[in-house]
Amino acid sequence: MEPLRLLILLFVTELSGAHNTTVFQGVAGQSLQVSCPYDSMKHWGRRKAWCRQLGEKGPCQRVVSTHNLWLLSFLRRWNGSTAITDDTLGGTLTITLRNLQPHDAGLYQCQSLHGSEADTLRKVLVEVLADPLDHRDAGDLWFPGESESFEDAHVEHSISRSLLEGEIPFPPTSILLLLACIFLIKILAASALWAAAWHGQKPGTHPPSELDCGHDPGYQLQTLPGLRDT
């Protein structure tokens, strides 16, 4: 694992987008509540959205957005197991991920929509923890008394921390592998171009690689296919 950590430190520039990212940790099988505070005056009249970041510079795929009528933004809207509700006066967007699963881990954004544009309110890194209380009595329902007792064991009272400038984040393995792959692909592409130029070949034939970036036996970075904004 140590070589991997050293490799990660080399790739940390690839995770520049994770600076000022807030980490929310949730327990598998339970619910996770993500809050995104914002300036209610600045974003007055704007609908909000929750999207999943597909890769470092990829698009942010919409998961769910608030009610089409801004005045009804307080109404909870669902897409599958993800809900969104907006306290427009208090300036807090709340996203609930129910029945959290390992594949929910990843980078997300809270967005403020205006026309076809979207401002990022907060970048969120969702981490999924193994359930430390697998046989806990309370089961999957959430009771405030339990969250005060167990603190981080019940995750709708979620753990969050900010990744400030200068702090080196250590994100989930799936993201790190993706970044490592991107980094290595860049190196391979550069090497191929250099080799092609050196040998006078066409820069189309890459040397075979044994790296299979799409398949991590432990954790796969799964995107959410065909999500519709209901």
């Epitope: 669902w78 709340t94 029945n99 999957d140 009771f143 405030p144 008394g145 339990e146 009272h157």
Partner: antibody, heavy 122, light 113 residues
Framework: EVQLQQSGPELVKPGASVKISCKTS????????MHWVIQSHGKSLEWIGG????????SYNQKFRDKASLTVDKSSSTAYLELRSLTSEDSAVYYC???????????????WGQGTSVTVSS | DIVMSQSPSSLAVSVGEKVTMSCKSS????????????LAWYQQKPGQSPKLLIY???TRESGVPDRFRGSGSGTDFTLTISSVKAEDLAVYYC?????????FGGGTKLEIK
């Protein structure tokens, strides 16, 4: 109008099982939790457990963990309570009740079914 | 489990009178994050299902007459009916939903003289 319509009274033999249904209408089942409460004759109310229809996640009162099983069928907007290994002590009225979730009102039970009477007798 | 104790177990009042009933919990129901007490009051009329009257200790459910008022915080709670009507004949239960498992009080039976 929100309605919770429970199945009719049951007369069952000791040791048998019974499955009570709670058909919901007037709201989206998956947006609320569903709870089951028992009321033994002339007594107070006891929470059996609750289910999150969206995920199927459940929570049981320790006392009823070996007695009850909660499920939902989202396609028919129906919640179920199955009771097993019944004894005469399980004779009671069983209610389904809609619970809001923890963000608005916690699990205050705002709509109740009419109750299903279960009598265990040989 | 949190124990909910209601008193009195029964009381008889005349129409138009003010009535108060008490509910005490064995531990605080106040959630520090939102400063709300996770306590509800229900009314169960003879032969009927329970009906939610009050949640978060003092918030009236929509459609509930304003003669019903919930108060209290932490461990001591009160349900007050400012001017009793004949239709208020029922058993009143308090319930905590602060901690697993949710528990109900034994009930207060309100009779009309």
């Amino acid at each position: 109008e929100v309605q919770l319509q429970q199945s009719g009274p049951e007369l069952v033999k000791p040791g048998a099982s019974v499955k009570i249904s709670c058909k919901t209408s007037g709201y989206t089942l998956s947006e609320y939790t569903m709870h089951w409460v028992i009321q033994s004759h002339g007594k107070s109310l006891e929470w059996i457990g609750g289910v999150i229809p969206n995920s199927g996640g459940t929570s049981y009162n320790q006392k009823f963990r070996d007695k009850a099983s909660l499920t939902v069928d989202k396609s028919s907007s129906t919640a179920y309570l199955e009771l097993r290994s019944l004894t005469s002590e399980d004779s009671a009225v069983y209610y389904c009740a809609r619970g809001d979730d923890s963000y608005r009102r916690g699990y205050a039970l705002d709509y109740w079914g009419q109750g299903t009477s279960v009598t265990v007798s040989s | 489990d949190i124990v909910m104790s209601q008193s009195p177990s029964s009381l008889a009042v005349s129409v138009g009178e003010k009535v108060t009933m008490s509910c005490k919990s064995s531990q605080s129901l106040l959630y520090s994050s939102n400063q709300k007490s996770y306590l509800a009051w229900y009314q169960q009329k003879p032969g009927q299902s329970p009906k939610l009257l009050i949640y978060w200790a003092s918030t009236r459910e929509s459609g509930v007459p304003d003669r019903f008022r919930g108060s209290g915080s932490g461990t001591d709670f009160t349900l007050t009916i400012s001017s009793v009507k004949a239709e208020d004949l029922a058993v009143y239960y308090c319930q905590q939903y602060f901690s697993y498992p949710p528990t109900f009080g034994g009930g207060t039976k309100l009779e009309i003289k």
